[in-house]
Interface confidence: low
């Protein structure tokens, strides 16, 4: 079928189209165009014979149109009135017609559209603004974008006159944004500049800067005003009711406690007419005096005096606070504080009290802290020590002994021999000894503060031949794989070697034993029961040897694993069952059995008469070390038979 | 005397955090209001943050400071903390902690600080 297709089917002002013919016929005369739904010979265009390829314009003819063999027929320069039907009238050689209809339309190429506002400058909660896409344009879709999106779902846009004006109700501050329009028809789209939206709002509340509304007597007040506002907020500020001046900042150099009161600043846009205004409380703080701290006993004795440290001065409505070596109070019984924490009481000092100690006033901006006290404690004299700790000396050297005796203040010493007064130092010198230098030492410490004395005395044996030695031990009964034991070689001689021996031999080779304090003293590490020994010490020097009586180690140990005997289970019925239970243990252990469960008796044998078959079952002895601590036990089946019914052993 | 060390500070570029610390072994800071302080050179030391004695419950910030710095302490490591998020040039400085709130001059000792530099 014959059929006219507008290539394209909308057409822009001053384009061309093409309608192209489908299905033409063959065996042709000609054809003609027709402006209009049918074939009108006032409407006719253009008219083509094929046998003379000749086109004869007609009455509809503007010039713009051009046909081709193929009957399709191209319009140039298109105009707004060349929109509607064309008709194509063929006629077959035979001279039968045909005829088909096509159609386009023509639109104008669209200008670039502005946006006109009916409210330059609307005022936030208050105005509403309306914007109208310009110019209005016949067969155009207006559409709207707020900041390059689609406008958003909101009660507060509406869409009118066709979607060409954009109505914004009750403006917000947040509608300040880049509003365009854009024009479409079917041959074009435009967009128009972008129109921001000036929203007077404000002033808000405004807020004041610095938060803090505490200050010191001395100090530089400024404060600082911004209030939310389009245009930019004017701002006064206020002090107790008064006007100080229109800035934005408020700045008062060092403040006198007069300072203090209500500071407001208000906030003013010219174009709302609106005004705000926010209050600040200031209070301004007189610099509090640095504290310092006074004691009731400036030198308390030890264990006897008790010492009161207040910090001064007294100011109503403070904190007060107490350091020790910086750090926060211990909990102690020994310390107090008073109920307005002014005064912390030491009682019954110690020379460890000495502190240092420091007190503070906390006021409402800040901890002052005093000087640091120290505590002046008397103590003392502890009982003195004479050094070195050698008993005996030979003849010819030098004795030279030093006593000291923990004490504040520093102890006074005096020296007496036999009980006779020598000298008032701390050293005593006796140059070349002899025998005669032999007897007791005694050193006197004095505290002149406390007038307390403590002696401590020391036997000097000068003598060429070395005395007898003796063993002391730190545990005269060590627990095997539990406990050491320290032997030590009696007296400290000077310039003498000491010697061990274990049942007469040199000492072994052992991990577990350990020489030291000059080889005086033998440490044996985790003893076991081989250790119980004869232990022997010896000394010498140039001139003479000595040894020890033995000292046997007597460790504790065990219980072992009891072992029941005789080892036989089965009996004959009518046999006596006679049990022996023997477990190694020091001391010997104590022995208890128990059959079947049930408790029998404290003895290390078990005797039962002519035992018969009510006699089966299990047999358990138990023993326990009280020294060591330790508990063991075994357990053994009996099995008894009657007379000849089984092999067996009798008793 | 008492001995204030501060730390944390350093090179970040504009936008970025930083957090400083600030501790002491010779004071224990549980009693004191503690506060931030920051000098530019030629400039008097101002004060950023303060937080209220033990529990820190009362914090105030300047306006330069507010929204962006937190301060914090933690009583058990006796430290006291800067959080500073979208930091900008002009924030350079050299930051100190110290007692005493507002009444800068009045602090016993100043730390050695620790140096903050932002750049664009």
């Known amino acids: 079928k014959l059929t006219i297709e507008s290539t394209p089917f909308n057409v822009a002002e001053g384009k061309e189209v093409l309608l192209l013919v489908h299905n033409l016929p063959q065996h042709l005369f000609g054809y003609s165009w027709y402006k209009g739904e049918r074939v009108d010979g006032n409407r006719q265009i253009i008219g083509y014979v094929i046998g003379t390829q000749q086109a004869t314009p007609g009455p509809a003819y503007s010039g713009r149109e051009i046909i081709y063999p193929n009957a399709s027929l191209l319009i140039q320069n298109i105009i707004q009135n060349d929109t509607g039907f064309y008709t194509l009238h063929v006629i077959k050689s035979d001279l039968v017609n045909e005829e088909a209809t096509g159609q386009f339309r023509v639109y104008p190429e669209l200008p670039k559209p502005s946006i006109s506002s009916n409210n330059s400058k609307p005022v936030e909660d208050k105005d509403a603004v309306a914007f109208t896409c310009e110019p209005e344009t016949q067969d155009a879709t207006y559409l709207w974008w707020v900041n390059n999106q689609s406008l958003p779902v909101s009660p507060r846009l509406q869409l009118s006159n066709g979607n060409r004006t954009l109505t914004l109700f009750n403006v917000t501050r947040n509608d300040t944004a880049s509003y365009k329009c854009e024009t479409q028809n079917p041959v074009s789209a435009r967009r128009s500049d972008s129109v921001i939206l000036n929203v007077l709002y404000g002033p808000d509340a405004p807020t004041i800067s610095p938060l803090n509304t505490s200050y010191r007597s001395g100090e530089n007040l400024n404060l600082s005003c911004h209030a939310a506002s389009n245009p930019p907020a004017q701002y006064s500020w206020f002090v107790n009711g008064t006007f100080q001046q229109s800035t934005q900042e408020l700045f008062i150099p060092n403040i006198t406690v007069n300072n203090s009161g209500s500071y407001t600043c208000q906030a003013h846009n010219s174009d709302t007419g609106l005004n705000r205004t926010t209050v600040t409380t200031i209070t301004v703080y007189a610099e509090p005096p640095k504290p310092f701290i006074t004691s009731n006993n400036s030198n308390p004795v030890e264990d006897e005096d008790a010492v009161a440290l207040t910090c001064e001065p007294e100011i109503q409505n403070t904190t007060y606070l107490w350091w020790v070596n910086n750090q926060s109070l211990p909990v102690s019984p020994r310390l107090q504080l008073s109920n307005d924490n002014r005064t912390l009481t030491l009682l019954s000092v110690t020379r460890n009290d000495v502190g240092p100690y420091e007190c503070g006033i906390q006021n409402e901006l800040s901890v002052d802290h005093s000087d640091p006290v120290i505590l002046n404690v008397l103590y003392g004299p502890d009982d003195p020590t004479i050094s070195p700790s050698y008993t005996y000396y030979r003849p010819g050297v030098n004795l030279s002994l030093s006593c000291h005796a923990a004490s504040n203040p520093p102890a006074q010493y005096s020296w007496l021999i036999d009980g006779n007064i020598q000298q008032h130092t701390q050293e005593l010198f006796i140059s070349n000894i002899t025998e005669k230098n032999s007897g007791l030492y005694t050193c006197q410490a004095n505290n002149s503060a406390s007038g307390h004395s403590r002696t401590t005395v020391k036997t000097i044996t000068v003598s060429a031949e070395l005395p007898k030695p003796s063993i002391s031990s730190n545990n005269s009964k060590p627990v095997e794989d539990k406990d050491a034991v320290a032997f030590t070689c009696e007296p400290e001689a000077q310039n003498t070697t000491y010697l061990w021996w274990v049942n007469g031999q040199s000492l072994p080779v052992s991990p577990r034993l350990q020489l030291s304090n000059g080889n005086r003293t033998l440490t044996l590490f985790n003893v076991t029961r081989n250790d119980a020994r004869a232990y022997v010490c010896g000394i010498q020097n140039s001139v003479s040897a000595n040894r020890s009586d033995p000292v046997t180690l007597d460790v504790l140990y065990g219980p072992d694993t009891p072992i029941i005997s005789p080892p036989d289970s089965s009996y004959l019925s009518g046999a006596n069952l006679n049990l022996s239970c023997h477990s190694a243990s020091n001391p010997s252990p104590q022995y208890s059995w128990r059959i079947n469960g049930i408790p029998q008796q404290h003895t290390q044998v078990l005797f039962i008469a002519k035992i018969t078959p009510n006699n089966n079952g299990t047999y358990a002895c138990f023993v326990s070390n009280l020294a060591t601590g330790r508990n063991n036990s075994i357990v053994k089946s009996i099995t008894v038979s009657a007379s000849g019914t089984s092999p067996g052993l009798s008793a | 005397e008492v001995q204030l060390v501060e730390s944390g500070g350093g090179l970040v570029q504009a936008g970025g955090s930083l957090t400083l610390s600030c501790t002491s072994s010779?004071?224990?800071?549980?009693?004191?209001?503690m506060g931030w302080y920051r000098q530019t050179p030629g400039k008097q030391r101002d004060l950023v943050a303060d937080?209220?004695?033990?529990?820190?419950?009362?914090?105030n910030y300047a306006g330069f400071a507010q929204g962006r710095f937190t301060i914090s302490r933690d009583n058990i490591k006796n430290t006291v903390y800067l959080q500073m998020n979208d930091l900008k040039p002009e924030d350079t400085a050299v930051y100190y902690c110290?007692?005493?709130?507002?009444?800068?001059?009045?602090?016993?000792?100043w730390g050695q600080g620790t140096q903050v530099t932002v750049s664009s």
């Open positions: 010779t004071l224990t800071f549980t009693p004191y209001r």
């Open positions: 937080i209220s004695p033990g529990d820190g419950s009362t914090k």
């Open positions: 110290n007692t005493y709130v507002a009444f800068v001059g009045r602090a016993r000792t």
